[in-house]
């Protein structure tokens, strides 16, 4: 049974930093590219970032480039999103996901809410 | 970035009737491996998204066959042959052929009373 559980969300002031985690279980984590996708309250989905199975490549949405860093620890089966210089427009539910593009099944976590507010 | 434009943004449908959602991309979604990476997601109220269709027309395992995808190049369509109550939600297209990946704005499917 595949499980993705995000944590680390909360209320943070503009300009501050926050680190999200996604604990993976039930599959061979170190073989998969992993994504972060976010959804602002009442809005649509926005793809945020991907990291390669071995951590060697990372791609980001233009809106977070230079501020957010995706990383992973394959020994801990955990995906991370380090968010810095946070802005009000980063307020969203952040989902980690596997297999967005290929494969016969996709998997998403339940999401963690990040609120950027003074 | 590749812009994904969905229409309509809101879609009221009678139960048992067909529904069709369009998705247009600002560039061709044919990837270097020859595959066209247009994906459709469903997000029911209060739930995480789930993928319905990948590579334009391939149904994800467990997705009912009333959902079908079609299209090529820059024009794509998601069809629901007979809408059921559980199909209520927002439908998103996603392109996975160019970095960064980009979603359409979403189409809200509602049941007509």
């Amino acid at each position: 049974q595949v499980h993705l559980v995000e944590s680390g969300g909360g209320v943070v002031q503009p300009g501050r930093s926050l680190r999200l985690s996604c604990a993976a279980s039930g599959f061979k984590f170190r073989s998969y590219g992993m994504h972060w996708v976010r959804q602002a309250p009442g809005k649509g989905l926005e793809w945020v970032a991907i990291i390669w199975y071995d951590g060697s490549k990372r791609y980001y949405a233009d809106s977070v480039k230079g501020r957010f860093t995706i990383s992973r620890d394959n020994s801990k089966n955990t995906l991370y999103l380090q968010m810095s210089s946070l802005r009000a427009e980063d307020t969203a539910v952040y989902y980690c996901a596997r297999d967005l593009i290929t494969g016969t099944t996709d998997y998403w976590g339940q999401g963690t809410l990040v609120t950027v507010s003074s | 970035d590749v812009v994904m434009t969905q229409s309509p943004l809101s879609l009221p449908v009678t139960l048992g009737q067909p529904a069709s959602i369009s998705c247009r991309s600002s560039r061709s979604l044919v990837y270097s491996d020859g595959n066209t990476h247009l994906i459709w997601f469903q997000q029911r109220p209060g739930q995480s998204p789930r993928r319905l269709i990948y590579r334009v027309s391939n149904r994800v395992s467990g997705v009912p066959d009333r959902f079908s995808g079609s299209g090529s190049g820059t024009d794509f369509t998601l069809k629901i042959s007979r809408v059921e109550a559980e199909d209520v939600g927002v439908y998103y297209c996603l392109q996975g052929a160019h970095w960064p990946y980009t979603f359409g704005q979403g189409t809200k499917l509602e049941i007509k009373r």
């Epitope: 599959f27 016969t104 099944t105 | 395992s61």
Partner: antibody
Amino acid sequence: DVLLQESGPGLVKPSQSLSLTCSVTGYSITSGHYWIWIRQFPGNKLEWMGYITYDGSNNYNPSLKKRISITRDTSENQFFLKLNPVTTEDTATYYCARDVADSYGNGYDAMDYWGQGTSVTVSS
Amino acid sequence: DIVLTQSPASLAVSLGQRATISCKASQSVDYDGDNYIHWYQQKPGQPPKLLIYAASNLESGIPARFTGSGSGTDFTLNIHPVEEEDAATYYCQQSDEDPWTFGGGTKLEIK
């Protein structure tokens, strides 16, 4: 194209150390992938020995863990196998290889690029 | 360790016919629907060459007459139609669980 080439001594004495080099051309070993050592014994049985990742971490076959070390020299684009001590049972053809990955971020722990292999005999 | 048992150990097939090689795993290598079984071809004096990865994905540049199938513990490599150049030894490999292990090989001869 990606090319891998093994080099090292053809003959090693029992209880000594075996050191092999894999020279990689056409791809930087720090750019990604797992860089793997595999050996094939007389009689053709294949054994996965271990790998080093693009960022220098390791994963070894538990049966060899006490004797094996895989390291690298990023400036020379080479990675190395050290087996210490060796016995006659380590006589084999040693291959270096690279793992398969797709364009979507996924890896498969299969090997698509291999060196030609180097034959090692352990004998006094 | 996961043991992979290949059968037959050798087979002789006529040109144009079908060759079928079986690989049985001592436990399931089906990790959430992803089958970590791979197939290689090895000719004398050469390193193994990847044919199929993840049970059924054809490696780039490999002819479509090579197909892989199976799930759980039972996997098959089919070659059809067999050509002269297919004479070689074929190995399956699992990477579902460390250590990665290989089957004992199947030697294919062309009649």
